[in-house]
């Protein structure tokens, strides 16, 4: 029960996280104009990974896409790449984890397969979260560097009369969305990995004790153990002790057409 809850919660947390990563990647407010020197500006600038926008005090907003690929800073390209990798890995992780959920039955998929899928999706979520956090952090670092550089040469006098003021940018809402979303995806991934341990079959192999009676060889099975012919260990490494209770999955022990999706 706890395993199912942990897995389900991990899935939900990761889902929210990945939705947040997608939202952050699409948002225009990665960096916003610093209003420290002029809190009542007639024009407010903000920039995203894909376009830059300006909102006039009238409410009129105009955005322009970065229609160049080669002309963009390498750091911005790197941030884009990290965010996209994070989204792709997260999306694949979500797809895998749906099939791995203990509460969803697909044919007679064994617990070992579900455990492997849970672990795979968990790792994918962790990497996805790390990609998002890394992407946002790289962008934040870039902003901090540029902020202090533009502060250093804030006013470059032209003939002592004219001021050309560089627009300084500070952290936008998307950065915080990205950090939180990346963190959630990471936490979700860790939860999936923890759930995987609970789902994974125990390594204990139960060997039947056999008694040789006159006539044909029969393996003696104490209550709760499945009957097995011969002496060999359970080669499928399947936990065959179930305390007397049997699930529907255990009854159907041979592959069926539903096993291969």
């Amino acid at each position: 029960m706890a395993v199912t809850a942990c897995q389900g919660l991990g899935f939900v947390v990761s889902l929210i996280g990945i939705a947040g990563i997608i939202a952050a990647t699409c948002m225009d407010q990665w960096s916003t104009q610093d209003l420290y020197n002029n809190p009542v500006t007639a024009v407010f600038n903000y920039q995203g990974l894909w376009r830059s926008c300006v909102r006039e005090s009238s409410g009129f907003t105009e955005c322009r896409g970065y229609f160049t690929l080669l002309g963009l800073p390498a750091m911005l390209q790197a941030v884009r790449a990290l965010m996209i990798v994070g989204i792709v890995l997260g999306a694949i992780g979500l797809l895998v984890s749906i099939f791995a959920l203990k509460c969803i039955r697909i044919g007679s998929m064994e617990d070992s397969a579900k455990a492997n899928m849970t672990l795979t999706s968990g790792i994918m979520f962790i990497v996805s979260g790390l990609c998002a956090i890394a992407g946002v952090s790289v962008f934040a670092n870039m902003l901090v560097t540029n902020f202090w550089m533009s502060t250093a040469n804030m006013y470059t006098g032209m003939g002592g009369m004219v001021q050309t003021v560089q627009t300084r940018y500070t952290f936008g809402a998307a950065l915080f969305v990205g950090w939180v979303a990346g963190g959630l995806t990471l936490i979700g991934g860790v939860m999936m990995c923890i759930a995987c341990r609970g789902l994974a079959p125990e390594e204990t192999n139960y060997k039947a004790v056999s008694y040789h009676a006159s006539g044909h060889s029969v393996a003696y099975k104490p209550g709760g153990f499945k009957a097995s012919t011969g002496f060999g260990s359970n080669t499928k490494n399947k936990k065959i002790y179930d305390g007397g209770a049997r699930t529907e999955d255990e009854v159907q022990s041979y592959p069926s057409k539903h096993d291969y999706v």
Partner: antibody, heavy 119, light 112 residues
Framework: QVQLVESGGGVVQPGRSLRLSCAAS????????VHWVRQAPGKGLEWVAV???????NYNSALKSRFTISRDNSKNTLYLQMNSLRAEDTAVYYC?????????????WGQGTLVTVSS | DIVMTQSPLSLPVTPGEPASISCRSS???????????LYWYLQKPGQSPQLLIY???NPASGVPDRFSGSGSGTDFTLKISRVEAEDVGVYYC?????????FGAGTKLEIK
């Protein structure tokens, strides 16, 4: 037909108050920003204040303490309350429309109302 | 506040001749998004101002194509290719990058 008609101007003594009105027709104040701009006799233009379609307000900091901009959406009318008037406030006061959906600034102006501050 | 300086203060022109009015701002009006927040207004005698050019170079609707605006971040020019009698009045430049919006002192265009 877009029209802005200012009223309420006249001769007023220093230290007294006056309220100017700007009746808008042909458009709704809830969709446009409206500015007050003044022009002293024989002088240039000076921006006073603006009220935006969403109710946000900006003032010229030099006049903020004495002037208050407001509007009545039901009457589609803009107001400028002027307190503690001084001789230097003598000017023609214009109201001007500012679209919220385009890059234009003040695109339509009223004919103005003259305020004379004199003892 | 951003200071707008216009020159000349008076400009006598012969009809049919070109005219040029200059405006300089104390701070660059070129925003990081590429827009320049400089506007030109004409106030004809006894009338209220009318918008001629917005964002430095874009003519407002109904403005004859003989009017054009150009400039850099701090130096701007309003050109009239062929002056007509109806163009007389005072021309103002205005910045709307920062509050308060500020106007130039005006250039009075007269017919010779």
């Amino acid at each position: 037909q877009v029209q802005l008609v200012e009223s309420g101007g006249g001769v007023v003594q220093p230290g007294r108050s006056l309220r100017l009105s700007c009746a808008a027709s042909g458009f709704s104040l809830t969709n446009y920003g409206v500015h007050w701009v003044r022009q002293a006799p024989g002088k240039g233009l000076e921006w006073v204040a603006v009220i935006w379609s969403d109710g946000r307000i900006n003032y010229n900091s030099a006049l903020k303490s004495r002037f208050t901009i407001s509007r009545d959406n039901s009457k589609n009318t803009l107001y400028l309350q002027m307190n503690s008037l001084r001789a230097e406030d003598t000017a023609v006061y214009y109201c001007a429309r500012h679209p919220a959906f385009g890059p234009h600034a003040m695109d339509y102006w009223g004919q103005g109302t003259l305020v004379t501050v004199s003892s | 506040d951003i200071v707008m300086t216009q020159s000349p203060l008076s400009l006598p022109v012969t009809p049919g001749e070109p005219a040029s009015i200059s405006c300089r701002s104390s701070k660059s009006l070129l925003n990081s998004n590429g827009n320049t927040y400089l506007y030109w207004y004409l106030q004809k005698p006894g009338q209220s101002p009318q918008l001629l050019i917005y964002r430095m170079s874009n003519p407002a609707s109904g403005v004859p194509d003989r009017f054009s605006g150009s400039g850099s971040g701090t130096d701007f020019t309003l050109k009239i290719s062929r002056v007509e009698a109806e163009d007389v009045g005072v021309y103002y430049c205005m910045q709307y990058l920062e509050y308060p919006p500020t106007f130039g002192a005006g250039t009075k265009l007269e017919i010779k």
